[in-house]
């Protein structure tokens, strides 16, 4: 079957549970179902999911029965719209009901929410946790997917189903080991971590499908591709790309069986064509299904082919440059980035879409020119401080992460952002601070070739955070600008705003600085979190501190925390020094 | 249209060469992806090396890496394929081939649009 050309089938559903067999056919749709309705009990979901498995089943023992030819996206969406207390939960979202499909699935899309207010997920008691393992499985990993699920409305769904079966794992191994906490946190923890970086990579894919369109998803996997398969054809890495962008489009869109079913043909494909591809897919290609698809998507760059010739040759210096662009222009373009970035695996993929788009805007100008070949001869040299930009930028803040270490790294960029964009809400600013500060531990360690693409695309996941979470609730005019004029530029954008001068400094409220003895049982983690959130609250009081200023407070807030959590009387420590510290802090800062 | 025509074939002793041209006239663009592939008498057509025309980047297969060496002249619009060290197992009938970059892929005759007639390469002592 070649992929993607599939024969039409009678009945879409039959035709998917089959495909993927009925344990990833529920999985996936339990996975559907609570990214749409993200509030609804699980129960509520279990008993959705069993319905339409059982009615998918009947559709397999015959297509022709009632309802069978029905496409997923009404078979599904009629199913959402039986759910009982739609309009008491979701409010305007019951209204999608009353639509046809299409319109009613780009409705339910559009109520996705990406900061649901949804309680935060405490990790219970180890031998909790293994009892409800042991007690019945199959209900703790259904739990695991709709947990995620709702939370991350956006989560590749083929991806969740890996991270389940490493869930399984963990508990399978641990539940029965002689310390179970000793082997069973630290892999919770890594599956936590990489479910929230993974969710992040595929927020900013959909974001860029969804908000961008099409050309621009397809730009950033030609040059991601190139740099990863840089031995490849172009026409390779072109049919790549081209089937990629229909699963990511698939998975975005909602059409998650869909997705599954063509990312494993995906992976088929690039398995079976390997020695046209990359020399590195060979131990991919051995594993199962779901662990090779997410192997191959992790694989690392193969070497780049010995002797690449100059770019400059046909790019630059030839007379045909013209000819060659008027001819087919998206395919001439798809070969200067594809070319760039196969001998770049130095550069982030941002880097390589800004010099493309700089490429792109001089022939536009020149070939209509009097003298073209004149006007275009200079073009590599306007890509140099295009390159240099975010060469110094990670110089300067590896330097300062390496000075300061990750959390006084993360305070410096919470104060460096709240008076870019002092109007975004505290948690937010705190949350993409906090991940932007991961940045220096996460890239600052790797040799400069592998900084910049380590860096700068880490920080395009992470900004994106930021314009997801404040499209929810727009409150700042330079936050939208950033992100919606152009997606490759959004980190030089943010990297450029100043101090906001428009801003009127918020009303001191003494109750944000009152602290109580349960900031002494938190974790480490916590804790830093709260000191942070004071942090961004001083910097929204006073805009002009300076960095002198803030740090004489927080290291006056962090030997206070530390005396009363030393005290007898921790809650009466915690008021008196508390007013002192406030008091100190408002004649320090000039409040 | 394209019209391609192969030359240079001929007998030749093992660890002999041989250059093969290719003359490409017609609408260039159409032939900025070009290729060589042979063909031995009862074994399915195989790619040898393509090359784009557009950044110069050349492919080969596997049994000719090191031995056989693909260019091509812009300005003369010709395609060359210059075999060293020739083995008894590389006799075969070679054609030159051209398409668009977005589709040719060496492992794929079926992704190329324009053929050559071909031109026949014995290695024999």
């Known amino acids: 079957r070649g992929v993607f050309r599939r024969d039409a089938h009678k009945s879409e559903v039959a035709h998917r549970f089959k495909d993927l067999g009925e344990e990833n056919f529920k999985a996936l749709v339990l996975i559907a179902f609570a990214q749409y309705l993200q509030q609804c009990p699980f129960e509520d979901h279990v008993k959705l999911v069993n319905e339409v498995t059982e009615f998918a089943k009947t559709c397999v023992a015959d297509e022709s029965a009632e309802n069978c030819d029905k496409s997923l996206h009404t078979l599904f969406g009629d199913k959402l719209c039986t759910v009982a207390t739609l309009r008491e939960t979701y409010g305007e979202m019951a209204d999608c009901c009353a639509k046809q499909e299409p319109e009613r699935n780009e409705c339910f899309l559009q109520h996705k929410d990406d900061n649901p207010n949804l309680p935060r997920l405490v990790r219970p008691e180890v031998d909790v946790m293994c009892t409800a393992f042991h007690d019945n499985e199959e209900t703790f990993l259904k739990k695991y997917l709709y947990e995620i699920a709702r939370r991350h409305p956006y989560f590749y769904a083929p991806e969740l189903l890996f991270f389940a079966k490493r869930y399984k794992a963990a508990f399978t191994e641990c539940c029965q080991a002689a310390d179970k906490a000793a082997c069973l946190l630290p892999k919770l923890d890594e599956l936590r971590d990489e479910g929230k970086a993974s969710s992040a990579k595929q927020r900013l894919k959909c974001a860029s499908l969804q908000k961008f369109g099409e050309r621009a998803f397809k730009a950033w996997a030609v040059a991601r591709l190139s740099q990863r398969f840089p031995k490849a054809e172009f026409a390779e890495v072109s049919k790549l790309v081209t089937d990629l962008t229909k699963v990511h489009t698939e998975c975005c869109h909602g059409d998650l069986l869909e997705c599954a079913d063509d990312r494993a043909d995906l992976a088929k494909y690039i398995c079976e064509n390997q020695d046209s591809i990359s020399s590195k897919l060979k131990e991919c290609c051995e594993k199962p299904l779901l662990e090779k698809s997410h192997c191959i998507a992790e694989v690392e760059n193969d070497e780049m082919p010995a002797d690449l010739p100059s770019l400059a040759a046909d790019f630059v210096e030839s007379k045909d440059v013209c000819k060659n662009y008027a001819e087919a222009k998206d395919v001439f373009l798809g070969m200067f980035l594809y070319e760039y970035a196969r001998r770049h695996p130095d550069y982030s993929v941002v880097l390589l879409l800004r010099l493309a788009k700089t490429y792109e805007t001089t022939l536009e100008k020149c070939c209509a020119a009097a003298d073209p070949h004149e006007c275009y001869a200079k073009v590599f040299d306007e890509f140099k401080p295009l390159v240099e930009e975010p060469q110094n930028l990670i110089k300067q803040n590896c330097e300062l992460f390496e000075q300061l270490g990750e959390y006084k790294f993360q305070n410096a960029l919470l104060v460096r952002y709240t008076k870019k964009v002092p109007q975004v809400s505290t948690p937010t600013l705190v949350e993409v601070s906090r991940n932007l500060g991961k940045v220096g531990s996460k890239c600052c360690k790797h040799p400069e070739a592998k900084r910049m693409p380590c860096a700068e695309d880490y920080l395009s996941v992470v900004l994106n955070q930021l314009c997801v979470l404040h499209e929810k609730t727009p409150v700042s005019d330079r936050v939208t600008k950033c992100c919606t004029e152009s997606l490759v530029n959004r980190r030089p954008c943010f990297s450029a705003l100043e101090v906001d001068e428009t801003y009127v400094p918020k009303e001191f409220n003494a109750e944000t600085f009152t602290f109580h003895a349960d900031i002494c049982t938190l974790s480490e983690k916590e804790r830093q979190i709260k000191k942070q959130t004071a942090l961004v609250e001083l910097v929204k009081h006073k805009p002009k501190a300076t960095k002198e200023q803030l740090k004489a407070v927080m290291d006056d807030f962090a030997a206070f925390v530390e005396k009363c959590c030393k005290a007898d009387d921790k809650e009466t420590c915690f008021a008196e020094e508390g007013k002192k510290l406030v008091a100190a802090s408002q004649a320090a800062l000039g409040l | 249209e394209v019209q391609l025509l192969e030359s240079g074939g001929g007998l030749v002793q093992p660890g002999g060469s041989l250059r093969l041209s290719c003359a490409a006239s017609?609408?260039?663009?159409?032939?900025?992806?070009m290729g060589w592939f042979r063909q031995a008498p009862g074994k399915e057509r195989e790619g040898v090396s393509s090359?784009?025309?557009?950044?110069?980047?050349?492919f080969y297969t596997n049994s000719v890496k090191g031995r056989f060496t693909i260019s091509r002249d812009n300005a003369k619009n010709t395609l060359y394929l210059q075999m060293n060290s020739l083995r008894a197992e590389d006799t075969a009938v070679y054609y030159c081939a051209a398409g668009s970059p977005a589709r040719c892929r060496l492992r794929d005759p079926t992704t190329f649009d324009y053929w050559g007639q071909g031109t026949l390469v014995t290695v024999s002592s």
């Open positions: 017609g609408n260039t663009y159409l032939t900025s992806c």
């Open positions: 090359i784009y025309t557009v950044g110069g980047s050349t």
